[in-house]
């Protein structure tokens, strides 16, 4: 799996997004998690309503929020009100039995609220390498990264 | 209060086309998925086709693939249903249906009769 | 494809009586199960979701139970609005289908 980066500004929200296929993912919950460490478990965060037929209503923990168009295939996360410890690597998952399909990897990166004016520097994310450089933009707030960029394995 | 009136049916002969419409009002049109469900005479209900509230996403049974195509002007509150390659089991009463994106109906309309026959 | 099938296919009640109908998923739907009720020459209207939420409007006389792949719909006292045909509809596997149909008829 590739990674995709997507960043956003202290204090503010981030929504994440992660494509599918309709399909396939069918009748699937979804899941959005944090990776602990180089090969810890991928931690839940949160996933969609324990009812599949309602995944399309916004689910909440905390200041995370799911919510899943299963017609269109994309599964929509939101972190409110972003802060230096949100930055890391997530992933969005497609849950099926005791599995999970990794949909898309994710780092998450904090950019510094240009109108705060404290010295805390403009940047956090973790494992920060020279690869990141190379990731191409998406667009306005993600990029992707090459496969092998990021040294977690795949736990798809 | 949600309301969705469909019109179009006939009577069409074998291999003939025909265009369902679903006028809807009541609540935000582009916010839903839309489906056609029909029902065969004296029959149990079978879903046809959806679209997304977009317009974006598009899917059918496979009896009518490749020969229904469904549509919506969003700007009109409107939604459609061109059938060609019509064949005597594709007589049903049509109803278009609103729902959520796992195809739960939540409100239907009346329906409208398609007879192919020759 | 997923067969659901409905037991019985017509059932006789009284008006004032309980009426049990049974729907049957050829696999484990979870809870991902609406009910519809059609009355002669009407749409259909949906009832329950859920397996057992009722609908907004849907009265309290009408309840749904069960997971997996067993699951029942209960009118607990049948009014002469109820005489109708119900179906049961799955939803988690594509595409979505729905059982033949139980007719509940005045006995």
């Known amino acids: 799996h590739n990674t995709t980066v997507f960043q956003g500004v202290a204090g503010q929200s981030l929504q994440v997004s992660c494509p599918y296929d309709s399909m396939k993912h069918w009748g699937r919950r979804k899941a959005w998690c944090r990776q602990l460490g180089e090969k810890g478990p991928c931690q839940r965060v949160v996933s969609t309503h324990n009812l599949w037929l309602l995944s399309f209503l916004r689910r909440w923990n905390g200041s995370t929020a799911i919510t899943d168009d299963t017609l269109g295939g994309t599964l929509t996360i939101t972190l409110r009100n972003l802060q230096p410890h949100d930055a890391g690597l997530y992933q969005c998952q497609s849950l099926h039995g005791s599995e999970a399909d990794t949909l898309r990897k994710v780092l998450v990166e904090v950019l510094a609220d240009p109108l705060d004016h404290r010295d805390a520097g403009d940047l956090w994310f973790p494992g920060e390498s020279e690869s990141f450089e190379d990731a191409h933009v998406e667009h306005s707030i993600s990029r992707s990264l090459l496969e092998g960029e990021i040294p977690f394995p795949p736990t798809s | 209060e949600v309301q969705l009136l469909e019109s179009g049916g006939g009577l069409v002969q074998p291999g003939g086309s025909l265009r369902l419409s679903c006028a809807a009002s009541?609540?935000?049109?582009?916010?839903?998925?839309m489906s056609w469900v029909r029902q065969a005479p004296g029959k149990g209900l079978e879903w046809v086709s959806v679209?997304?509230?977009?317009?974006?996403?598009?899917y059918y049974a496979d009896s009518v693939k490749g020969r229904f195509t469904i549509s919506r002007d969003n700007s009109k509150n409107t939604l459609y249903l061109q059938m060609n390659s019509l064949r005597a089991e594709d007589t049903a009463v049509y109803y278009c249906?609103?729902?959520?994106?796992?195809?739960?109906?939540?409100?239907w309309g009346q329906g409208t009769l398609v007879t192919v026959s020759s | 494809e997923i067969v659901m099938t409905q037991s019985p296919a017509t059932l006789s009640v009284s008006p004032g009586e309980r009426a049990t109908l049974s729907c049957r998923a050829s696999q484990s739907v979870s809870s991902n199960l609406a009910w519809y009720q059609q009355k002669p020459g009407q749409a259909p209207r949906l009832l329950i979701y859920g397996a057992s939420t009722r609908a907004t409007g849907i009265p309290a006389r009408f309840s749904g139970s069960g997971s997996g792949t067993e699951f029942t719909l209960t009118i607990s006292s049948l009014q002469s609005e109820d005489f109708a045909v119900y179906y049961c509809q799955q939803l988690p596997y594509w595409p979505p289908t729905f059982g033949g149909g139980t007719k509940v008829e005045i006995k």
């Open positions: 009541g609540f935000t049109f582009s916010s839903y998925a």
């Open positions: 249906a609103k729902g959520t994106p796992t195809l739960l109906f939540q409100h």
């Open positions: 679209i997304s509230g977009s317009g974006g996403s598009t």
